[in-house]
Interface confidence: low
């Protein structure tokens, strides 16, 4: 599923991401934009053999199990396929673990490079939340 900007903002808010670990909703929507272009089925292979999955491009080396990443830790205890669902529950639950891990949203390269320090509130402007 490819979410609309405000549709995703509403879904993320419903799942409790607004101000989760101090990161406003705009940060999460911005991250999703530059990680996956709001596409829940986005997958990208990394040079180390791991793969990033879903709307927040969660990595199979650490966070999920795709059955093909050597040494996978699967810290979210989920199959990576679950992160491709049109329902973002699995991605959100896992993202909450990731952002609580010490580095905050710096874990997402796209957020670090494209969202951090910018007017992230623009990503939810005009949305009825």
């Amino acid at each position: 599923k490819v979410f609309g900007r405000c549709e995703l903002a509403a879904a993320m808010k419903r799942h409790g991401l607004d101000n989760y670990r101090g990161y406003s909703l705009g940060n999460w929507v911005c991250a999703a934009k530059f990680e996956s272009n709001f596409n829940t089925q986005a997958t990208n292979r990394n040079t180390d053999g791991s793969t990033d999955y879903g709307i927040l491009q969660i990595n199979s080396r650490w966070w999920c199990n795709d059955g093909r990443t050597p040494g996978s830790r699967n810290l979210c205890n989920i199959p990576c396929s679950a992160l491709l669902s049109s329902d973002i529950t699995a991605s959100v639950n896992c993202a909450k673990k990731i952002v609580s891990d010490g580095n905050g949203m710096n874990a997402w390269v796209a957020w670090r490079n494209r969202c951090k320090g910018t007017d992230v509130q623009a990503w939810i402007r005009g949305c009825r939340l």
């Epitope: 599923k1 419903r14 409790g16 829940t40 089925q41 997958t43 205890n77 989920i78 199959p79 396929s81 679950a82 491709l84 669902s85 049109s86 329902d87 529950t89 639950n93």
Partner: antibody
Framework: QVQLQESGAEVMKPGASVKISCKAT????????IEWVKQRPGHGLEWIGE????????YYNEKFKGKATFTADTSSNTAYMQLSSLTSEDSAVYYC?????????WGQGTTLTVSS | DIELTQSPATLSVTPGDSVSLSCRAS??????LHWYQQKSHESPRLLIK???QSSSGIPSRFSGSGSGTDFTLSINSVETEDFGMYFC?????????FGGGTKLEIK
């Protein structure tokens, strides 16, 4: 509107295999999980597993690994569940449902009877 | 696996009564809890998603509440068409699991 149409009732012999179908209409089939659920009298509802038709990704309840196999044909918007090595324990109503975490749309159910 | 325990197993009520059905999870499932109604020889029907969000077309007498491990489905002034089985289901983790059900029957 969203609809899931399952194949008709089946009577099979122990040891045989059966393939149940679930045809989806009214939405983009490839991007939503199709869930499979088993119901036996006195046993409530049991989640068998799910398939994401667009990618072919599957996830099975450990209890049903080796028993159920999911496939999907995006050209006909149809999901399939094959059950193998049938026993009387497999006699049940099997439902497909559209997965959104919750299951907002269900098929009408396929009744499977396994009897010699 | 997360176990969902529903109580009571059977609830005998008179039309017009208000009732509460309980669903308890073996561990915290946040707000990832959904309720279904199933009548005899029919498929389950979604009533409530994410604890308290009413599904499309569901009468306002049905409502849900709770969080974490304890959840309640309330029916305000039961009508005759409400009798049947009620199941809760969690989507917090895999495998998805259902409660054993509560049978709502006419007294």
């Amino acid at each position: 509107q969203v609809q899931l149409q399952e194949s008709g009732a089946e009577v099979m012999k122990p040891g045989a295999s059966v393939k149940i179908s679930c045809k989806a209409t009214g939405y983009t089939f490839s991007t939503y999980w199709i869930e499979w659920v088993k119901q036996r009298p006195g046993h409530g509802l049991e989640w068998i597993g799910e398939i994401l038709p667009g990618s072919g990704s599957t996830y099975y309840n450990e209890k049903f690994k080796g028993k159920a196999t999911f496939t999907a044909d995006t050209s006909s918007n149809t999901a399939y569940m094959q059950l193998s090595s049938l026993t009387s324990e497999d006699s049940a109503v099997y439902y497909c449902a559209r997965g959104d975490g919750f299951y907002g749309y269900w098929g009408q159910g396929t009744t499977l009877t396994v009897s010699s | 696996d997360i176990e969902l325990t529903q109580s009571p197993a059977t609830l005998s009520v008179t039309p017009g009564d208000s009732v509460s059905l309980s669903c308890r999870a073996s561990q915290s499932i946040s707000n990832n809890l959904h309720w279904y109604q199933q009548k005899s020889h029919e498929s389950p029907r979604l009533l409530i998603k994410y604890v308290s969000q009413s599904s499309s077309g569901i009468p306002s007498r049905f409502s849900g509440s709770g969080s974490g491990t304890d959840f309640t489905l309330s029916i305000n002034s039961v009508e005759t068409e409400d009798f049947g089985m009620y199941f809760c289901q969690q989507s917090n983790s895999w495998p998805r699991t259902f409660g054993g059900g509560t049978k709502l029957e006419i007294k």
